[in-house]
């Protein structure tokens, strides 16, 4: 044969032309539309991606591949039929027209056709393997999706049951809250009613209180009048008793005293029912010895035993140790009760000491000591004070710790001088210290710049002499 060429016709079919001598053989083969030519950029593993395809996309592609396979199968069948038909025709023609040496050409053509068929078959096999691979992958993905779906379904079921539980709980709580609200409303109503009742009661009580206050004012006026009368009577009675006891003892010393209840201090007098200011007879602790004292039954709840009073300068306070020991002056006026009695009394239980002061300008102040006692004479009636409160200075004007008592004839101070002689009066001098309530009495307009006057430094300063002073004691548990 002269030549053999392959070309494409106008409609895209493959054309095999064989020239042999005067004879020319042309074979037309159909090209499948859905198949790629061997020269096309085809990658056999293009479907094997790392990232999984979406489920719907995979199904679509699978369908496309199935169609391709089906088309290929049909095409193969057509090709076989076509080859058989052509072979029959060719064989008839060859038998009719061909010479002996054309047999080789025919065999070559047959071989080429077989090669073509083999090539197509190989391609189909490749596609088939790819489809199978993709199918397997898709099956795995489907299985994964199925498992994931099952898991999600389980989670949804769990969450649904949880939501149901929470809804049940919520409804229970809502019911409870509603019940509580109802209860609260009822309580509020009852409270409102009670409030209204109380307001009525308060207004009633206010009117009663107003009436009582009016009555109290009237009673107070009457009481003060009665108290004055009683005080006057008491003084008269006391004077009479003194006169009678003097005259009786002069006439008949064997007449026994009328038995009477003894009081240790004014607090006991007060508790026995004697609640009027005045002079009362007190008995020394564990003794029959008596002493007269003035009792303040009004100030700060009453029951106060007055141990010192200055008010007008009528009594001389520049006295001896013995006089300060036993006491001197007039209990209804200026006086000193006595160190021995005060020492013994404050030895029995805890006492408080209150010192009340008046200046010449009409001002008053006080110092209150929560703890007070005097040591025995052996320790020079040393003063002990603790727990200061009051308006007469934040610092104690009686030196702390307490000092021994000193008089003009008993110098126990901490000064090389003799404070009692220099400043006059008996007192718990330091060296000489910030106070002396037993100093010289100076009248108004002569009371300033006096170093030896009635001094309470932390209220009025060093040179000011006070108008009036009162020292009083009472049991701490009164």
């Amino acid at each position: 044969y002269n030549n053999f060429r392959k070309s494409m016709d106008s409609i895209g079919k493959k054309q095999y032309q064989v020239q042999h001598g005067s004879c020319s053989y042309t074979f037309l083969l159909p090209e499948m539309d859905n198949c790629r030519s061997s020269s096309s950029p085809y990658v056999s593993n293009a479907v094997q991606r790392d990232a999984p395809l979406e489920y719907d996309d995979s199904v679509q592609r699978l369908q496309v591949l199935e169609n391709i396979m089906e088309n290929n199968t049909q095409w193969l069948m057509k090709l076989e039929n076509y080859i058989q038909d052509n072979m029959k025709k060719e064989m008839v023609e060859i038998q009719q027209n061909a010479v002996q040496n054309q047999t080789a050409v025919m065999i070559e053509i047959g071989t080429n056709l077989l090669n073509q068929t083999a090539e197509q078959t190989r391609k189909l096999t490749d596609v088939e393997a790819q489809v199978l691979n993709q199918t397997t992958r898709l099956e795995l993905q489907l299985l994964e999706h199925s498992l994931s779906t099952n898991k999600l379904e389980k989670q949804i079921l769990d969450q649904t049951s949880e939501i149901n539980k929470l809804q049940d709980k919520n409804s229970f709580l809502e019911k409870k809250v509603l019940a509580m609200e109802d209860k609260h409303i009822i309580q509020l109503q009852s409270i409102k009613e009670e409030k209204d009742q109380l307001q009525v009661l308060v207004s009633k009580q206010n009117s009663i209180i107003e009436e009582l206050e009016k009555k109290i004012v009237t009673a107070t006026v009457n009481n003060s009048v009665l108290q004055k009368q009683q005080h006057d009577l008491m003084e008269t009675v006391n004077n009479l008793l003194t006169m009678m006891s003097t005259s009786n003892s002069a006439k008949d010393p064997t007449v026994a005293k009328e038995e009477q209840i003894s009081f240790r201090d004014c607090a006991e007098v007060f508790k026995s029912g004697h609640t009027t200011n005045g002079i009362y007879t007190l008995t020394f602790p564990n003794s029959t010895e008596e002493i007269k004292a003035y009792c303040d039954m009004e100030a700060g709840g009453g029951g106060w035993t007055i141990i010192q009073r200055r008010e007008d300068g009528s009594v001389d306070f520049q006295r001896t140790w013995k006089e300060y020991k036993v006491g001197f002056g007039n209990p209804s006026g200026e006086y000193w009760l006595g160190n021995e009695f005060v020492s013994q009394l404050t030895n029995q239980q805890r006492y408080v000491l209150k010192i009340h002061l008046k200046d010449w300008e009409g001002n008053e102040a006080y110092s209150l000591y929560e703890h007070f006692y005097l040591s025995s004479e052996e320790l020079n009636y040393r003063i002990h004070l603790k727990g200061l409160t009051g308006t007469a200075g934040k610092i104690s004007s009686i030196s702390q710790p307490g000092n021994d008592f000193s008089t003009k004839d008993g110098d126990n101070d901490k000064c090389i001088c003799k404070c009692s002689q220099m400043l006059t009066g008996g007192w718990w001098f330091d060296a000489c210290g910030p106070s002396n309530l037993n100093g010289m009495y100076y009248p108004q307009r002569q009371n300033t710049n006096k170093f030896n006057g009635i001094k309470w430094y932390y209220w009025k300063g060093s040179g000011y002499s006070l108008k009036a002073t009162t020292m009083m004691i009472r049991p701490a548990d009164f």
């Epitope: 030895n347 029995q348 239980q349 805890r350 703890h371 025995s376």
Partner: nanobody, 120 residues
């Protein structure tokens, strides 16, 4: 002059006993309340026990310490049993009020103190 002199202190092992004495002079002893106080280093003086002239007493040591007095000898005693290391202190004798006060304020005469050391 009024004086109080303590004696009987010393070193003792934990669980042991000591008897402190306090002799008074120059004061009407029988009418005074006598008390024992102690002071550990860096701490305030604290009440231990007190006894009145008639013999009534009060203490703070849960029955381990007993106070007593002999008015004829003008002496007060403190018997300390089952001693603990925390009982280590200087023990002071004091004379005071006629009532059984626990506050140092109410005692106006003090001894110089005696050291008690309890080792563990």
């Amino acid at each position: 002059e009024v004086q109080l002199v303590e004696s009987g202190g010393g070193l003792v092992q934990a669980g042991g006993s000591l008897r402190l004495s306090c002799a008074a002079s120059g004061r009407t002893f029988s009418s005074s309340v006598m008390g024992w106080f102690r002071q550990a280093p860096g701490k305030e003086r604290e009440f231990v026990a007190a006894i009145s002239g008639s013999g009534s007493s009060t203490d703070s040591a849960q029955g381990r310490f007993t106070i007593s007095r002999d008015n004829a000898k003008n002496t007060v005693y403190l018997q300390m049993n089952s001693l603990k290391p925390e009982d280590t202190a200087v023990y002071y004798c004091a004379a005071g009020r006629a009532f059984l006060a626990r506050d140092t304020f109410y005692y106006d005469i003090w001894g110089q103190g005696t050291q008690v050391t309890v080792s563990s």
